[in-house]
Amino acid sequence: ELCDDDPPKITHATFKAVAYKEGTMLNCECKRGFRRIKSGSPYMLCTGNSSHSSWDNQCQCTSSAARNTTKQVTPQPEEQKERKTTEMQSQMQLADQVSLPGHCREPPPWENEATERIYHFVVGQTVYYQCVQGYRALHRGPAESVCKMTHGKTRWTQPQLICTGETEPSQFPGEEEPQASPDGLPESETSR
């Protein structure tokens, strides 16, 4: 069952999942100047059975430069940051070689993918938080949030994390020391 809303936002922190439960959707988003192809699902889906899960549908982006697209949307205050390198994503994915039944790993990047990945999570999903570079984690409890179903409604638990001050970024479960990823998370695996 899909979670009704997105995980909580923590100031100066990003979150990611180590693995994604079946039923999770990942929107096929493209970077500026590109758009999703007109045939094909608007999202990838983590699907499968208890023994093997994988991402169904493939996201594809095509150049929108040739099209006469009129700007009808109020522009964003800032342009999106450039995506970090695929090498860095691969480094992060090496830390993600988990094999949880009924879960998918982080899907590989697709060409001209947008900077930020937009997931629709399902009930039971856990996401983990870390402070962005330059902020120190003050923990009052687990720096994670779980989507739970109570009385027919979904809600995310509140992560017990405050990010303050100057220091190295904290780590997600199962990751190496920060030098493997000095700039924090690859953009594709963060949500702000």
Epitope: N27, R35, S41, L45, N57, T69, V73, I118, H120
Partner: antibody
Framework: QVQLQQSGAELVRPGTSVKMSCKAA????????IGWIKQRPGHGLEWIGD????????NYNEKFKGKATLTADTFSSTAYMQLSSLTSEDSAIYYC???????WGQGTLVTVSS | DNVLTQSQKFMSTSVGDRVSVTCKAS??????VAWYQQKPGQSPKALIY???YRYSGVPDRFTGSGSGTDFTLTISNVQSEDLAEYFC?????????FGGGTKLEMK
């Protein structure tokens, strides 16, 4: 709580235009496409088009090109649909949808009558 | 355009019954199909996405199945509140299209 609040019913003259709104709350507006659907008794549901508020993108059903114009204002988290050169065929309930069709507005009834 | 056909416009049922609403696509859509429930005077409500996954708050008596061109929404142990119109939708390719609807009525 995710909500899509649509503007009120409209009674309009043939040949004129109407602009309706859909205000989103409870999720990140710029992350998801907003779709627009037409429903007329005996005609079922028709997909008009969609707009990505976080970019410059719109998609239209060929049938509604020139009839519908979709826009969005990211600062007020509101999507708009304008219908032009109205005829009795445009009398219908129009719905906006968000978060991959998971949520629907309450609908805006448009009645075209002289 | 990909035409979705719901061959039965009306289906009669009784409380406690099991009923299956079918939807056939003119072109392969994989599993990119959703099901909606609409009660008189209300907006459609999303029940199923990706052919077989339930949205939150949807009772587990609603089950979606199928892939390719043939899809089914099954309601087991029908309740009186399930009497409504049911629509299928494909979102595999633009323009997205809907089935004509199937109205569930009491015998």
């Amino acid at each position: 709580q995710v909500q899509l609040q649509q503007s009120g019913a409209e009674l309009v003259r043939p040949g004129t235009s109407v602009k309706m709104s859909c205000k989103a709350a409870g999720y990140t507006f710029t992350n998801y496409w907003i779709g627009w659907i037409k429903q007329r008794p005996g005609h079922g549901l028709e997909w008009i088009g969609d707009i990505h508020p976080g970019g410059d993108y719109t998609n239209y059903n060929e049938k509604f090109k020139g009839k519908a114009t979709l826009t969005a204002d990211t600062f007020s988290s509101t999507a708009y649909m304008q219908l032009s050169s109205l005829t009795s065929e445009d009398s219908a309930i129009y719905y906006c949808t968000g978060r991959n069709f998971a949520y629907w507005g309450q609908g805006t009834l448009v009645t075209v009558s002289s | 355009d990909n035409v979705l056909t719901q061959s039965q416009k009306f289906m009669s049922t009784s409380v406690g019954d099991r009923v299956s609403v079918t939807c056939k696509a003119s072109q392969n859509v994989g599993t990119n199909v959703a099901w909606y429930q609409q009660k008189p005077g209300q907006s459609p409500k999303a029940l199923i996405y990706s052919a077989s996954y339930r949205y939150s708050g949807v009772p587990d008596r609603f089950t979606g199945s199928g892939s390719g061109t043939d899809f089914t929404l099954t309601i087991s142990n029908v309740q009186s509140e399930d009497l409504a119109e049911y629509f299928c939708q494909q979102y595999n390719s633009y323009p997205y299209t809907f089935g004509g609807g199937t109205k569930l009525e009491m015998k």
